[in-house]
């Protein structure tokens, strides 16, 4: 999704709400654009997961390890 006139109007916007599993909303984000390596400044952002940078939004998102949820994969999924 390399449209050069696209605005990062969701710059700073994270995937999902605090109660959502970021891994799920990352899939939704993929329709809007592809991912790149997270900037180094976000290396500690995702607690139990890995960071991906949403190119269209210019913001980090987390793909949680199994059994973890939350924007930063910071919570144990009690239903896992």
């Amino acid at each position: 999704d390399g449209n050069s006139t696209r605005s990062p109007e969701t710059n700073g916007l994270l995937c999902g709400d605090p109660e959502e599993n970021c891994a799920a909303t990352t899939t939704q984000s993929k329709r809007k654009g592809h991912f790149s390596r997270c900037p180094k400044q976000y290396k500690h952002y995702c607690i139990k997961g890995r960071c991906r940078f949403v190119v269209a939004e210019q913001t980090p998102s987390c793909v949680c390890d199994e059994g973890y949820i939350g924007a930063r994969c910071e919570r144990v999924d009690l239903f896992y």
């Epitope: 990062p8 700073g12 900037p39």
Partner: antibody, heavy 116, light 106 residues
Framework: QVQLLESGGGLVQPGGSLRLSCAAS????????ISWVRQAPGKGLEWVSY????????NYADSVKGRFTISRDNSKNTLYLQMNSLRAEDTAVYYC?????????WGQGTLVTVSS | DIQMTQSPSSLSASVGDRVTITCRAS??????LGWYQQKPGKAPKLLIY???SLQSGVPSRFSGSGSGTDFTLTISSLQPEDFATYYC????????FGQGTKVEIK
């Protein structure tokens, strides 16, 4: 339209404290990272700090680490910067800006002067 | 920390000129680079993000290019409202700005 309005600047003595506020409107504040960026008189831009959407993740420039604290109140659509142990070199216009990586909307800035 | 070096620090140009400003990072930042325009007494305005993507509402005479360590902002035909100071900013390893390039009327 997106608006960011800083307040709380003023004259303070070295070693003193000040709390800046940034009132946001025109967008869903609780979904965005927000930053503070400053500019000393006649100088360039310097990133100060950012905070993520829910206030769980913050970072600071080395020059302010341990002295400044960023926070937010999503119920009030407001960002804060608590500045302690202020130094002459902290004199600058302080801008709040939307975003953590790059900054697509900026406030008009508030001037902080640290002088005896 | 990553240092950003802009050149030139200032330049004089005329309306209609093609203007090029360069920015060099002290280490590779992929394409994590933005360009801003600032006029005296005003807040900066985002022009370009991700090295080459034009921010919404910004005239198409502005363009950005580069990746890794070397980046360029080009104004294809300078307009009266373009006289300002321009800053690059990397956002790979924290957020650091170049020292600025002042574009003045010749």
């Amino acid at each position: 339209q997106v608006q960011l309005l800083e307040s709380g600047g003023g004259l303070v003595q070295p070693g003193g404290s000040l709390r800046l506020s940034c009132a946001a409107s025109g967008f869903t504040f609780s979904r965005y990272w927000i930053s503070w960026v400053r500019q000393a008189p006649g100088k360039g831009l310097e990133w100060v700090s950012y905070i993520d959407s829910w206030g769980s993740y913050t970072n600071y420039a080395d020059s302010v680490k341990g002295r400044f604290t960023i926070s937010r109140d999503n119920s009030k659509n407001t960002l804060y910067l608590q500045m302690n142990s202020l130094r002459a070199e902290d004199t600058a216009v302080y801008y709040c800006a939307r975003g953590g990586s790059l900054f697509d909307y900026w406030g008009q800035g508030t001037l902080v002067t640290v002088s005896s | 920390d990553i240092q950003m070096t802009q050149s030139p620090s200032s330049l004089s140009a005329s309306v209609g000129d093609r203007v090029t400003i360069t920015c060099r990072a002290s280490q590779g930042i992929i394409s994590y680079l933005g360009w801003y325009q600032q006029k005296p007494g005003k807040a900066p305005k985002l022009l370009i993000y991700a090295a080459s993507s034009l921010q919404s509402g910004v005239p198409s005479r502005f363009s950005g290019s580069g990746s890794g360590t070397d980046f360029t902002l080009t104004i294809s035909s300078l307009q009266p409202e373009d006289f300002a100071t321009y800053y690059c900013q990397q956002y790979d390893d924290w957020d650091t700005f170049g020292q600025g390039t002042k574009v003045e009327i010749k």
